[in-house]
Amino acid sequence: MMTGTIETTGNISAEKGGSIILQCHLSSTTAQVTQVNWEQQDQLLAICNADLGWHISPSFKDRVAPGPGLGLTLQSLTVNDTGEYFCIYHTYPDGTYTGRIFLEVLESSVAEHGARFQIP
């Protein structure tokens, strides 16, 4: 039975040119996390493997930094970075857990940094 839940930073906004931390946390399970994939729509941004550590996709190397923890830091944000991001936890015995974050990159300084809430 899959007992775990993914908590995420939910809907967040940030300023163009700034940076943002995408964070997910798997709780309520003792399942072994073998790997966490970070994806934007259908593009793989990064992988964190329990044994091998981090791998950042070559096309995102300049703007994506691993961490903190299993999270991901996006830098030099552009309006084109607006959209859905997914953290995909590969575990056993439970299987796969997926969390969703929506990032809106704003032109002005009215962006609410660190707005945190969970999407059901």
Epitope: M2, H25, A31, Q32, V33, A50, D51, Y92, G95
Partner: antibody
């Protein structure tokens, strides 16, 4: 090389307490769920507890629930088992174990003996 | 709780001959994820247990190919194609598809 070294076993009176430690090395401790398994003298293996990599989730069988507490210090690469209200039937060798490759107990320590007797 | 029942309790073997150990679970140990988390361990005298087989039929690294696992649902088997003297010890099956995690009672393999 993965190494797990248990310590803290010994002789304790019924109703007493003991804290076992498992020092881990050779891998990223904070990435792994960890477990304790015990074996009474001349008997089979029994799963005792497990804890998630972050320490936020734990499971126990009914035989030890409410008496044993598993915990970890990821900054010290150490797993713990706090055993309270000990009974004669808790006498056993206690092993810590780590998963790997889709297996739950891929790596084991050498064990530490706990004897509960008056 | 899932009860794991092993047979036989004791298995006298002749070196070079095959051997087989059965493990039955009281209910299906197919996990919701679709995987069957059934493992086999060998505990040699005076040693810690060692993993032989995981997910029913996968040999762990360094395990000789004379060991093989099979089965599905509730019925599982560990086979040793040609027993060697170093294979003596107690063999345990184990499931972690369900909590509590449970071991079989063990099968003692000894040389005739």
């Amino acid at each position: 090389e993965v190494q797990l070294v248990e310590s803290g076993g010994g002789l304790v009176q019924p109703g007493g307490s003991l804290r076992l430690s498992c020092a881990a090395s050779g891998f990223t401790f904070s990435s792994y769920t960890m477990s304790w398994v015990r074996q009474a003298p001349g008997k089979g293996l029994e799963w005792v507890s497990e804890i998630s990599s972050s320490g936020g989730s734990t499971y126990y069988p009914d035989t030890v629930k409410g008496r044993f507490t598993i915990s970890r210090d990821n900054s010290k690469n150490t797993l713990y088992l706090q055993m309270n209200s000990l009974r004669a039937e808790d006498t056993a060798v206690y092993y810590c174990a780590r998963p790997g490759l889709g297996a739950w107990f891929a790596y084991w320590g050498q064990g530490t003996l706990v004897t509960v007797s008056s | 709780d899932v009860v794991m029942t092993q047979s036989p309790l004791s298995l006298p073997v002749t070196p070079g001959e095959p051997a087989s150990i059965s493990c039955r679970s009281s209910q299906s140990i197919v996990h919701n994820s679709g995987n069957t988390y059934l493992e086999w361990y060998l505990q040699k005298p005076g040693q810690s247990p060692k993993l032989l087989i995981y997910k029913v039929s996968n040999r762990f690294s360094g395990v000789p190919d004379r060991f093989s696992g099979s089965g599905s649902g509730t019925d599982f088997t560990l086979k040793i194609s040609r027993v060697e003297a170093e294979d003596v010890g107690v063999y345990y099956c184990f499931q972690f598809s369900h909590v509590p995690r449970t071991f079989g009672g063990g099968t003692k393999v000894e040389i005739k």
